[in-house]
Structure formats: structure tokens, C-alpha cells
């Protein structure tokens, strides 16, 4: 089968429009969930963002942040989260394996479980970008 | 050699629902969007939506949301275009298409089945 | 949702001639756009995606290019097998749209 040229396929202008995106619609889920008065934030609840020894954008743990997401759209039917598949999906392999979440069952625990990864999320793209851009730095000293 | 073929012609009344099937075969992977369009006589190509048949993940054309079901058979590797409520404008070939890696997005359809006629008329 | 300008919507041109048709994003969309050529009665084939890499067996006198969101294919000397409608598809969110198709001919 034809295989595509990995590096051809990818200009760092591409991928930082796609984090830049990403992080834009992070704080836009954010923003949603927030509005939910009385829920707290949970310890229990760890979403992967950045793998220390792959170099961006492959330090994102894509696959697992889409996985985390894709659980949040189906206990809450947040439209951007379609949007931020789509665009986690242009960073995610594909042959990556899957990623099982557990999900709460209680209807509290699913507010907190929502709460506290959207908020990770949106903290965890900051951290890609912040990441992209210091090594687009680093590239061209 | 992947290879996507598709359900034959049909000829549908006004009103009824129609339902076209695409299977796929020579193609192993699993995070991958598969896109249907459709083309009316002498008319441009147009986007109806896509499906992750990993998920039966599901986007439609705002046009078509509502009336156009898109599913998928993880088991036979067979993707489904349903279309109700038919009028005689839904007169068109219907295509599916995937893409090839190395992403889970695509970045253009290298595969496309051999186009499904179907022609509405009382 | 984005629009895909293409223009011309249709061309007429010499054996040899360059010619080139465009589509213009109406915003950012980066290298996610495709390009296809379909023939008469034939199905749709992918010529460039990605902006501007050229699919298997594509001859290399098709190429395509990118200029903040205008995407230009270029066919660098007209062949008369290239008689067919070309059309752009975007990949940037969904809904995909695709441009309005130009139809190239000989004259």
C-alpha cells in the first residue's frame, strides 16, 4: 500500500495552527462546563497530555486525550468536543492504539469527571503550544 | 489492493427512503474517516457527511441533517448511506470514499467506490 | 461552514498550454486540500492532497500549490486526456465542502 511521506505531510506552520486551534476550542469547552455551579474539581482523574521523550507534536498523547473526550461527548453532549476530534485526529496515528477510560456511573462523579478533564485539557494545550513554540526556537538557534 | 464497492441502482418513488451500502476490503486499519458525496446529472460533486466506522462517530451536511442516516458494520466492513423523505432532486450517483494513512483525519479521498445511481421519480 | 471558491468554472485551452485553476478558502484551512479529476461517466480521482503532494501514479505534470488560502493546480502542458472537470475538497472541519469544479477542454 502507499505510504506517505510522514515529514512532507506535516510543515510545523500546520501542526502549530492545529494546537493554536485546539487550544482555542479547549477554553471554549471549558468556558461550557464551567457553568455548572456547585461541582469540584477531582483527584481521581488524570488525562495523559505530553510525553517527555517523543518530540512535538508526537509528545501529545493524542489518542488518549481524544479517548478521554469522546467519553465527556457521550455523558454530555458538547458539539465543540466534534470539532476538537477532528482536530485531534489530524495529530493521531492511524494505528495508535486504543485507549479504555473507566466512567463514573454517578451523576455527580460524571460532573466531576467532566469538570476536571476539560480543565486538564485546556491546561494541557497550552503546555503542547508552549512546548511547539520553544522548540520551533530551539530549531532555529 | 483496497477496494470499495458499492450496492447497485435503484429507482425509488417520492417519499421513500433509500439505503446504499459500501464495502470495503484489502483496507486493516481502524481510526480512518470515510466521507459519502453525491452528484446530480451534469452537477458538482457535493459533501453529504463522513462516519468513523471505528466509533459509528457520525458529521452530516447541514442540507441533509435530518433526513440522511450514515452507518457503519464493523464486522463486515460495510458502510450504509440511508436517505428519507426522497424527491425527485435526490435523483444522483452516490459515492463513498476513505482515505489513505498515515493520520486518522484525512487529507483527500484516494479510494472511492464505483458510484451508486439512484434515480427518484413517481 | 468554509466555502471553496474555484475558479474558473471553465477553461479552454491549447495541447500544451499551461493551465491553471484556483480555489480560494474563505479562511485559514492550512495544506488540508485536495484536488481531484473526474472524466466523463468516471469516478472521481485524487490528483494532489495535502495541499501539494501528488497521489500515486499522478503524472508529474499536475501539481499543486498554496498561497495563504488560495490552492492552485497547475497542469504544467496539456494533454487531451486531461479533458475533465477538476474539483478542490477541503479537509480543514467538517463539513468537507468541495469547490464548484472546472471543466477543462481543448480547443
Known amino acids: 500500500s502507499h505510504t506517505l511521506p510522514v515529514r512532507l505531510l506535516r510543515p510545523s506552520d500546520d501542526v502549530q495552527k492545529i494546537v493554536e486551534e485546539l487550544q482555542s476550542l479547549s477554553k471554549m469547552l471549558l468556558k461550557d462546563v464551567e457553568e455548572e455551579k456547585g461541582v469540584l474539581v477531582s483527584q481521581n482523574y488524570t488525562l495523559p497530555c505530553l510525553s517527555p521523550d517523543a518530540q512535538p507534536p508526537n509528545n501529545i498523547h493524542s489518542p488518549a486525550i481524544r479517548a478521554y473526550l469522546k467519553t465527556i461527548r457521550q455523558l454530555d453532549n458538547k458539539s465543540v468536543i466534534d470539532e476538537i476530534i477532528e482536530h485531534l485526529d489530524k495529530l493521531i496515528f492511524q494505528d495508535a492504539p486504543e485507549t479504555n477510560i473507566s466512567v463514573p456511573t454517578d451523576t455527580h462523579e460524571c460532573k466531576r469527571f467532566i469538570l476536571t478533564i476539560s480543565q486538564q485539557f485546556s491546561e494541557c494545550m497550552d503546555l503542547a503550544l508552549k512546548s511547539l513554540t520553544s522548540g520551533a526556537q530551539q530549531a532555529t538557534t | 489492493q483496497v477496494q470499495l464497492v458499492q450496492s447497485g441502482a435503484e429507482v425509488k418513488k417520492p417519499g421513500s427512503s433509500v439505503k446504499v451500502s459500501c464495502k470495503a476490503s484489502g483496507y486493516t486499519r481502524t481510526r480512518y474517516w470515510m466521507q459519502w458525496v453525491r452528484q446530480a446529472p451534469g452537477q458538482g460533486l457535493e459533501w453529504m457527511g463522513a462516519i468513523y466506522p471505528g466509533e459509528g462517530d457520525t458529521r452530516y451536511s447541514q442540507k441533509f441533517k435530518g433526513r440522511v442516516t450514515i452507518t457503519a458494520d464493523k464486522s463486515t466492513s460495510t458502510a450504509y448511506m440511508e436517505l428519507s423523505s426522497l424527491r425527485s432532486e435526490d435523483t444522483a450517483v452516490y459515492y463513498c470514499?476513505?482515505?489513505?494513512?498515515?493520520?486518522?483525519?484525512?487529507?483527500?479521498?484516494?479510494?472511492w467506490g464505483q458510484g451508486t445511481t439512484v434515480t427518484v421519480s413517481s | 461552514a468554509i466555502q471553496m471558491t474555484q475558479s474558473p468554472s471553465s477553461l479552454s485551452a491549447s495541447v500544451g498550454d499551461r493551465v491553471t485553476i484556483t480555489c480560494r478558502a474563505s479562511r485559514n484551512i492550512g495544506n488540508y486540500l485536495a484536488w481531484y479529476q473526474q472524466k466523463p461517466g468516471k469516478v472521481p480521482k485524487l490528483l494532489i492532497y495535502y495541499a501539494k503532494t501528488s497521489a500515486e501514479g499522478v503524472p508529474s505534470r499536475f501539481s499543486g500549490s498554496r498561497s495563504g488560502t488560495d490552492y492552485t493546480l497547475t497542469i504544467s502542458s496539456l494533454q487531451p486526456e486531461d479533458v475533465a472537470t477538476y474539483y478542490c475538497q477541503h479537509f480543514w472541519k467538517t463539513p468537507w465542502t468541495f469547490g464548484g469544479g472546472t471543466k477543462v477542454e481543448i480547443k
Open positions: 470514499a476513505f482515505p489513505e494513512g498515515p493520520y486518522a483525519a484525512p487529507y483527500g479521498m484516494h479510494y
